[in-house]
């Protein structure tokens, strides 16, 4: 079995303020078992945007049905985008454990926010 890769096909996405942003992410393997998390930014100060395993993320919905068998699509939609949401978003695969540990990150998608059309 080939080692899992995290694919973020869009290097950048531009969204008008007030609209929803769709950030694409797929993985290439069911192995290892473990959740996906999305972050804005990298390094120790990165901001958690979505955690498949736990937490409440009212602005985030998953694009596909992540509970379904053999699902490898972990794209998300973020609603009501504002300029404060601009940044680079990383889709990160974690490996099941106690606690779950980071396994592999996507290359990132830069979100830019356009002014709301008048």
């Amino acid at each position: 079995e080939e080692e899992l890769q995290v694919i973020q096909p869009d290097k950048s996405v531009s969204v008008a303020a007030g609209e929803s942003a769709i950030l694409l992410c797929t993985v290439t393997s069911l192995i290892p078992v473990g959740p996906i998390q999305w972050f804005r930014g990298a390094g120790p100060a990165r901001e958690l945007i979505y955690n498949q395993k736990e937490g409440h993320f009212p602005r985030v919905t998953t694009v596909s049905e992540s509970t379904k068998r053999e699902n490898m699509d972990f794209s998300i939609s973020i609603s009501n985008i504002t300029p404060a949401d601009a940044g680079t978003y990383y889709c990160v695969k974690f490996r099941k454990g106690s606690p779950d540990t980071e396994f592999k990150s996507g290359a990132g998608t830069e979100l830019s926010v356009r002014a709301k059309p008048s």
Partner: antibody
Framework: QVQLVQSGAEVKKPGASVKVSCKAS????????INWVRQAPGQGLEWIAM????????HYNQIFKDRATLTTDTSTSTAYMELRSLRSDDTAVYYC????????????WGRGTLVTVSS | DIVLTQSPDSLAVSLGERATINCRAS??????????IFWYQQKPGQPPKLLIY???NRDSGVPDRFSGSGSGTDFTLTISSLQAEDVAVYYC????????FGQGTKLEIK
């Protein structure tokens, strides 16, 4: 950490029904399947059914399709398994188990609920 | 339905020796590039514990003396050097279709 806490032991008469609960914590309940498995005294494991709490999709072992019903209460992160028309050979430990990889496998298990069917 | 048959039903192995448990499926459990076989360990009075998923992948925290192998219809759980705490009943399970378990193999110390 993931925890599945099951309801206490039950003693039932033949023909009665039992409803076993499984309260989940440590994860988002609607993001992972719950399986139910039973084990008769001194016997092996027997898969009963599974449920996706996000939309209540269920899959049943044909053996149990007419007698078992799985439900969930997402407000309390609790899964339920009801078994009707109980017989003495339904005496078993009933386990709930969470599928962390959507592989139709059982990653985390409750401690089990002993259901005794006796007249 | 796919039936899983484990062999042997029981097994006695000396401490430090290799233990091998087999699981044969009545038809192939390979699909989408994966072998949909899982192995569990159950000690007395405890729920089962997942050891191996998708035939050959150790679950988190499982000692590396446990390994899984096989493809298609024939699968093996191997304990490379038996420890006293490995005494248990071992079950295979498939999920190529809806899940079923093998009948179990009781592992004891010789």
């Amino acid at each position: 950490q993931v925890q599945l806490v099951q309801s206490g032991a039950e003693v039932k008469k033949p023909g009665a029904s039992v409803k076993v609960s499984c309260k989940a914590s440590g994860y988002t309940f609607t993001n992972y399947w719950i399986n139910w498995v039973r084990q008769a005294p001194g016997q092996g494991l027997e898969w009963i059914a599974m449920i996706d709490p996000s939309d209540s999709e269920t899959h049943y072992n044909q053996i149990f399709k007419d007698r078992a019903t799985l439900t969930t209460d997402t407000s309390t992160s609790t899964a339920y398994m009801e078994l009707r028309s109980l017989r003495s050979d339904d005496t078993a430990v009933y386990y709930c188990a969470m599928d962390y990889g959507s592989l139709y496998a059982m990653d985390y298990w409750g401690r089990g609920t002993l259901v005794t069917v006796s007249s | 339905d796919i039936v899983l048959t484990q062999s042997p039903d029981s097994l006695a192995v000396s401490l430090g020796e290799r233990a091998t448990i087999n699981c044969r499926a009545s038809q192939s459990v390979r699909s989408s590039g994966y072998n949909w076989i899982f192995w569990y360990q159950q000690k007395p009075g405890q729920p089962p514990k997942l050891l191996i998923y998708l035939a050959s992948n150790r679950d988190s925290g499982v000692p590396d003396r446990f390994s899984g192998s096989g493809s298609g219809t024939d699968f093996t759980l191997t304990i490379s050097s038996l420890q006293a705490e490995d005494v248990a009943v071992y079950y295979c399970q498939h999920s190529r279709e809806l899940p079923t378990f093998g009948q179990g193999t009781k592992l004891e110390i010789k």
